[in-house]
């Protein structure tokens, strides 16, 4: 079964910078990669960013720079401008869109506890929606 | 086809609070990033904010903090901006467009609102 | 904030011809530039996203080119109906508008 893996991480630089990675694990090809905070895509999350393989990529503040880092893992770096984190206490989820096996997504969260430069584990809290 | 369709011009006084509202048709209104631009006389073209109608979520342009309430209605796929105590700076067209995201920003527009702020 | 300088802010050109406007941003903008027509008590249109993607329905007479913080926009074959303002937009963190070209069509 496929399955896809969360990782958030608080910069030991930057306090106020976070990274989300993301990967899919399972056949077929990946067709496009949405990451969204505060909930799922299309279930009261907000999206952060768009990964397609050939389009290209969007992201929205406070995203700053989504890439691939694989042909089936992506990063996304966000700055948190506000006095205080929103981030350390939000969800992040991200849909892999592949053929054939459809939509699957997962989300994961900063550890509560997390030191600087420590990433949570692989969370697969999977939400198997194969749409 | 999707289409923008903003409120009629609006003539208020000084001090006052509008609402624009700018009905979207033609797409699942919850999957895009609503944006609203200003444009004084003569003048060029200016981001207020975006709203992410699925979430309510905003963002504004700092210069816009304060002026500028971006909400929405998901049940008639409205978006709504709140303009309040309004001075003469603030006569301009107001747009409402769509981030399109892979598609490009700002893919599809409104027609404009204009707002006249006089005594 | 993301600045973008776009220049010239007016000019004239002959129908058939072609003109080319310059947008420079104050930052790398990785390429999320796009460019918008915008004609008196209309809305704007969006020509071109990503420094060089038509938007559907563009004719291929619009072009962009660029990257890092430097961008151009060209239109060749001039028809009467290019009249118009034209504005850079800066995606790459929030957005940015470029101060507008005015086209005159002789």
């Known amino acids: 079964t496929p399955e896809v893996w969360v990782q958030v991480q608080m910069e030991a630089t930057e306090l106020s910078s976070f990274t989300v990675h993301c990967g899919f694990l399972g056949p077929g090809s990946i067709s496009l990669v949405t990451v969204s905070w505060g909930g799922p895509d299309g279930a009261g999350g907000t999206k952060l960013a768009v990964l397609h393989p050939e389009l290209g990529t969007r992201q929205w503040a406070p995203a700053r720079q989504a890439r691939w880092e694989t042909q089936s893992s992506i990063s996304l770096a966000l700055e948190d401008s506000g006095a205080s984190s929103p981030f350390a206490n939000t969800t992040f989820c991200c849909k892999f869109a592949s053929f054939p096996e459809g939509s699957w997504e997962s989300c994961g969260s900063l550890p509560p506890s997390s030191d600087p430069g420590l990433s949570a584990p692989p969370t697969p809290v999977p939400i198997l929606r194969a749409d | 086809q999707v289409h923008l369709q903003q409120s009629g011009p609006e003539l208020v006084k000084p001090g006052a609070s509008l609402k624009i509202s700018c009905k979207a048709s033609?797409?699942?209104?919850?999957?895009?990033?609503l944006n609203w631009v200003k444009q004084r006389p003569g003048q060029g073209l200016e981001w207020i904010g975006w709203i992410f109608p699925g979430s309510e979520s905003t963002f504004y342009n700092e210069k816009f903090k304060g002026k500028a309430t971006l909400t929405v209605d998901k049940s008639s796929s409205t978006a709504y901006m709140l303009l309040n105590s309004l001075t003469s700076e603030d006569s301009a067209v107001y747009f409402c467009?769509?981030?399109?995201?892979?598609?490009?920003?700002?893919?599809?527009w409104g027609q404009g609102t204009t707002l006249t702020v006089s005594s | 904030d993301i600045q973008l300088t776009q220049s010239p802010s007016s000019l004239s050109a002959s129908l058939g011809g072609k003109v080319t406007i310059t947008c420079k941003a104050s930052q790398d903008i990785n390429k999320y530039i796009a460019w918008c027509q915008h004609k008196p008590g209309k809305g704007p249109r969006l020509l071109i996203h990503?420094?060089?993607t038509l938007h559907p329905g563009i004719p291929s007479r619009f072009s962009g080119s660029g990257s890092g913080r430097d961008y151009s926009f060209s239109i060749s074959n001039l028809e009467p109906e290019d009249s118009a303002t034209y504005y850079c937009l800066q995606y790459d963190y929030l957005l940015t508008f470029g101060g507008g070209t005015k086209l005159e069509i002789k």
């Open positions: 990503y420094t060089s």
């Open positions: 033609g797409y699942t209104f919850t999957d895009y990033y």
């Open positions: 467009t769509r981030d399109g995201g892979l598609r490009g920003p700002f893919d599809y």
